[in-house]
């Protein structure tokens, strides 16, 4: 459109063109113009450029007029916005950039019969590009001077000179695009094209064989695989192979067949050859194996004294036979070694699709939730369960259940309820459905039926199994008493289910580890070692440290069997008069070797780290975000490329922090609405949107922009007795006990009695971290053997 | 005032291929911002976008009927063309051409010419 | 493909009354989309485009809202014109569009 604005009119005599007056007689005295003043408006005609102006012709641009804006002499430069000194020529074709503009300034004379009289006219010439920006221009002769400016403007979404370019922008499967200065259209990120409406594809998707209808998508094409589909699949059901183009089978070292799944070196994966024989590949999956003198078999399983290795598994009794041996399984197990538990599953007997699960020497019928008894044949009373939450009574039914819902209740468990929410909560809460009510989960800080004011937070007894609350600022922390841990004292972790220990061993559970008490003939953590008591053969005591006993598995007939008084990190070294010394391992000192060198003791451990003694080592467990042997390294946050849409990436500690491009908005720039979603806040954190960023409100136990920082409020004062490094794991903590010490606070000393290492029915005295043998009359030695 | 105008035979036999041409006046099919769709209407049932072409010649289709279907344009002629191959009686509807608008919507359509495939 | 779903299929309104009609998506297209009016015979005619403005020529008592996958056409004032099938269509991916609404004198 076509814009001009008259500023300002100075007509001083009140005099029109012709030389009269506007209104009235000339003073006799100073040939002024008496009486009242013009009545001035203007009247503007565009037209087609003419070098050489013409008055009449018609004004082929538009023409238009104001209505009377002021009298003799008037400033308008100071009134903006004042639309009666205005006029505005829409156009509807390509503006042509050069014009002919008609000015003309005109006394309305208010009544029907005497017409109009011109003040002064304007004429101009020129050239005019669409702009925001006015162009002014004066009448400087003739009776009256007048200023007015002028511009035009394009319409909106029309560029160019011409305002005959079109953009608009759009974010819609026709394009993807927003306008320059200029009206070119410049590509949202992801798309590309003219019309910007092709999706640019995962940066490495294949060309050849993905392509996407989505930006950063890559799809496959038939036959290819992979985040960049550059992957053949291979042939359905090849084993050891790989492929160059879709469907082959191209076999691995040692492989053959069309599927790759003959093995051209059985020796070498599978090792078949027991008890120290040479195997030899004879073809594809087959081999031989040529056994030591006093083994044979295809596996040189078959030992000649084949009941000395034990061979009967699961308490079976051997009896050698000429061919070997022959196990007499007990009750429940089969098979040559009695390794096989019998499948008492086969028939099933559990009925109404109960599962069956093989036990040994019997069976256990896993039944659905309608069904109970030994065969799952009994109909379960499902309402004992109570599964009615909200209910008057719950009806059981076969192999099902009904409950008679309260008023306001629905759904089978009647667990559905009216929403009754409805924006009562204040201060950002928000609201939880009722029974024919509300209520409001305020956010930290806040209160009351309406979240109107502040909160105590131990006011609700969060802390389970006797925690004692402490209330803080906009938190709380639960101390918890011991054997349980956890933000609210809620973990109770039992070790000993299932049960690890073997050979009828008993479980001990303890804060962070199980402990198997072995039956007299076992030993190891789990007590699945056989041990050896010297019981069949007499034993002859050699120094304080040594015991011979006869044997037929050595040349000369007798085996040494040294003392464990050392334990096991050191070596017993025999001293005159019956004593003894303790030679000890690397990382190991006292009497019996019995304690661990702290190697901590230097601190080596950076950035927070807690240093964990090792035998001999350290290990350091870094705090969020750091990394390395010594936590040395600040994690790169940004390695996985995280800000999305073009945002820059900036690595912080156990974090990153992306600098949005676009108006794109988020943790990480993936969001045209929000800055939150729900991985914005780690660890529980609630996300508030703040416009041009996020905060994160954190539980407690956590902190940093994303709550992303474990406080180690937590390990201060240390809580751990007896030297137990503590370890921050989030609100709580976790102690790393040193050798002979326990519990969830490394409290209680270890039972180094336990299982029994004095022999002979010696008695056992319990010490920090070591133990002493008592021995029974007859016997000596650090272990009374 | 632009204006659309669809030609092409109203009875094609089934296995064969349906071919319609869109007359452009009043307006130039070269004027970009501008998709020339074809879109069509079952009996007394809704109606079915079937695909669109830009003067530059790239098109898209909708993804149920790509196999089948083919739009090309002749800007010397002002005119654009669909072609569905492999019909069947499913086929039989009102073919309509239309304008997707420079700001959104498709503001001009041709009056519609019925096709029926039958033998 | 996003799947457009009109209520009702049928509006009995008597001329002079107010009628709304609803569109739903499965999915979100944000405000693009667009409603049109078709009378037997006659090809569709473009109302409105990005959910809510007003094509060229069509009278004010026609009026959309709505975004995401909730939307509405109100028309405030029926004349003996507007009895006609109505369609709502998404164009944020390939374009489809409702099964229609037909609005019937009552």
């Known amino acids: 459109q076509f814009e001009l604005e008259i500023l300002s009119m100075q007509n001083v005599n009140g005099e029109l063109q012709n030389g009269n007056c506007c209104g009235g007689a000339r003073n006799p005295g100073d040939r002024k113009c008496t009486r009242d003043e013009c009545d001035t408006y203007f009247k503007v005609c565009l037209k087609e450029y003419q070098s050489r102006v013409t008055a009449g012709g018609p004004c082929s641009f538009g023409s238009g007029s104001t209505p009377v804006i002021g009298g003799n002499t008037f400033n308008l430069k100071a009134s903006r916005g004042n639309d009666r000194n205005r006029i505005v020529l829409p156009f509807s074709f390509a503006w042509p950039r050069s014009y002919t503009l008609l000015v003309e300034a005109w006394d309305s004379s208010n009544d029907t019969v005497q017409p109009d009289s011109i003040i002064e006219k304007a004429s101009h010439s020129g050239m005019i590009n669409p702009s925001r920006q006015w162009q002014t221009l004066k009448q400087n002769t003739g009776v009256a001077h007048f200023e007015y400016q002028i511009r035009v403007t394009c319409d909106d979404y029309y560029y160019g000179f011409g305002c005959n370019k079109f953009c608009r922008p759009r974010d819609d499967f026709f394009g993807h695009y927003a306008c320059d200065q200029n009206g070119n259209k410049t590509c949202m990120e992801g798309w590309m094209g003219p019309e910007c409406n092709r999706a640019i594809c995962r940066q490495g998707c294949s060309p050849k064989h993905g392509s996407c209808k989505l930006p950063g998508d890559c799809r496959c094409q038939y036959g290819w695989q992979g985040l960049y589909c550059d992957k053949c699949i291979p042939h359905p059901g090849c084993v050891h192979g790989i492929c160059n183009e879709p469907w082959q089978c191209l076999c691995e070292t040692n492989w053959g067949g069309q599927l790759c799944d003959k093995d051209l070196n059985y020796c070498g994966t599978h090792q078949p050859c027991l008890n120290g024989g040479t195997c030899s590949n004879t073809g594809p999956d087959k081999y031989q194996c040529s056994c030591p003198e006093g083994y044979s078999g295809p596996n040189c399983e078959i030992a000649e004294h084949a009941c000395l290795s034990d061979p009967c598994h699961n308490r079976g009794s051997c009896k050698e036979t000429s061919l070997g041996f022959e196990c007499e399984c007990s009750p429940g197990w089969t098979g040559p070694t009695c390794s096989t538990n019998i499948d008492d599953c086969s028939p099933n007997n559990c009925s109404h699709g109960g599962t069956c699960q093989d036990l040994v020497n019997g069976f256990k019928c896993v039944c659905p939730p309608q069904w109970t008894g030994k065969t799952c044949q009994l109909d379960a009373n499902e309402c004992e369960a109570k599964p009615c939450v909200n209910a008057k009574s719950c009806k059981n039914l076969i192999a099902s259940y009904y409950c008679d819902c309260l008023p306001g209740w629905m759904g089978q468990n009647c667990d559905i309820n009216i929403n009754d929410c409805l924006g009562q909560c204040q201060n950002d809460a928000s609201c939880r459905d009722l029974v024919n009510g509300y209520r409001c989960i305020c956010p930290p800080g806040y209160a009351g039926d309406h979240c109107e004011r502040d909160i105590d937070e131990c006011a609700s007894n969060p802390c389970l199994n006797g925690g004692h609350c402490q209330n803080e600022i906009n938190r709380f922390q639960c101390l918890c008493p011991t054997g349980f841990s956890g933000n609210l004292c809620q973990l109770d972790i039992d070790y000993c289910e299932p049960n690890p220990c073997q050979n009828g061993a008993q479980c001990y559970n303890r804060a962070s580890d199980y402990f198997c008490k072995c039956p007299e003939d076992y030993e190891g953590k789990n007590c699945s070692h056989l041990k050896d008591h010297c019981r069949t053969t007499p034993c002859e005591v050699i120094d304080s440290c040594t015991v011979a006993m006869a044997s037929n598995d050595t040349p000369e007939g007798v085996r040494y069997i040294s003392s464990n008084v050392c334990g096991p990190h050191g070596k017993c070294k025999s001293q005159s008069g019956g004593k003894f010394t303790c030679d000890c391992n690397k990382g190991f000192t006292g009497t019996y070797c019995h304690e661990n060198i702290n190697d901590c003791e230097s601190n080596p451990c950076r950035n927070g780290g807690t240093c964990i003694d090792g035998v001999n080592s350290y290990k350091c467990i870094c705090s969020d975000g750091w990394e390395g042997a010594y936590c040395e390294t600040n994690i790169n946050d940004c390695s996985q490329n995280p800000c999305h849409n073009g945002g820059t990436c900036r690595d912080l500690v156990n974090d990153f922090y992306c600098d949005c491009k676009n108006g794109w908005k988020g943790k990480t720039c993936h969001s045209r609405d929000s800055q939150c979603d729900e991985a914005t806040c780690n660890n529980g954190g609630t996300c508030y949107d703040e416009g041009d960023a996020f905060k994160c409100m954190c539980p407690g136990g956590w902190e940093g922009t994303t709550c992303n920082i474990a406080r180690n409020s937590s390990c201060l004062p240390n809580p751990c007795h007896n030297g137990g490094t503590c370890v921050v794991n989030g609100e709580s903590f976790t102690c790393v006990c040193k050798e002979g010490w326990e519990g969830p606070i490394c409290a209680q000393n270890t039972n180094d009695c336990s299982p029994h290492p004095c022999y002979n029915s010696g008695t056992c005295v319990d010490g920090d971290n070591w133990y002493r043998c008592e021995c029974a009359p007859g016997f000596a030695g650090p272990d009374c053997r | 005032q632009v204006q659309l105008q669809e030609s092409g035979p109203g009875l094609v036999k089934p296995s064969q291929t349906l071919s319609l041409t869109c007359t452009v006046s009043?307006?130039?099919?070269?004027?970009?911002?501008?998709?020339w769709s074809w879109i069509r209407q079952h009996p007394g049932k809704g109606l079915e976008w079937i695909g669109y072409?830009?003067?530059?010649?790239?098109?898209y289709y909708n993804p149920s009927l790509k196999s089948r279907v083919t739009i090309s344009v002749d800007t010397s002629k002002n005119q654009f063309s669909l072609k569905l191959s492999s019909v069947t009686a499913a086929d039989t509807a009102v073919y309509y051409c239309?304008?997707?608008?420079?700001?959104?919507?498709?503001?001009?359509w041709g009056q519609g010419t019925l096709v029926t495939v039958s033998s | 493909e996003i799947v457009m779903t009109q209520s009702p299929a049928t509006l009995s309104v008597s001329p002079g009354d107010r009628a709304t009609l609803s569109c739903r998506a499965s999915?979100?297209?944000?405000?693009?989309l667009a409603w049109y009016q078709q009378k037997p015979g006659q090809a569709p005619r473009l109302l409105i485009y990005?959910?809510?403005t007003r094509a060229t020529g069509i009278p004010a008592r026609f009026s959309g809202s709505g975004s995401g996958t909730e939307f509405t056409l109100t028309i405030s004032s029926l004349q003996s014109e507007d009895f006609a099938v109505y369609y709502c269509?998404?164009?944020?991916?390939?374009?489809?569009f409702g099964g229609g609404t037909k609005v019937e004198i009552k």
């Open positions: 239309a304008r997707w608008g420079a700001a959104a919507g498709f503001d001009y």
């Open positions: 009043g307006g130039s099919i070269s004027s970009g911002g501008y998709f």
């Open positions: 072409i830009y003067y530059s010649g790239s098109t």
């Open positions: 999915q979100s297209v944000r405000s693009n």
């Open positions: 990005g959910a809510s």
């Open positions: 269509q998404q164009y944020t991916d390939w374009p489809t």
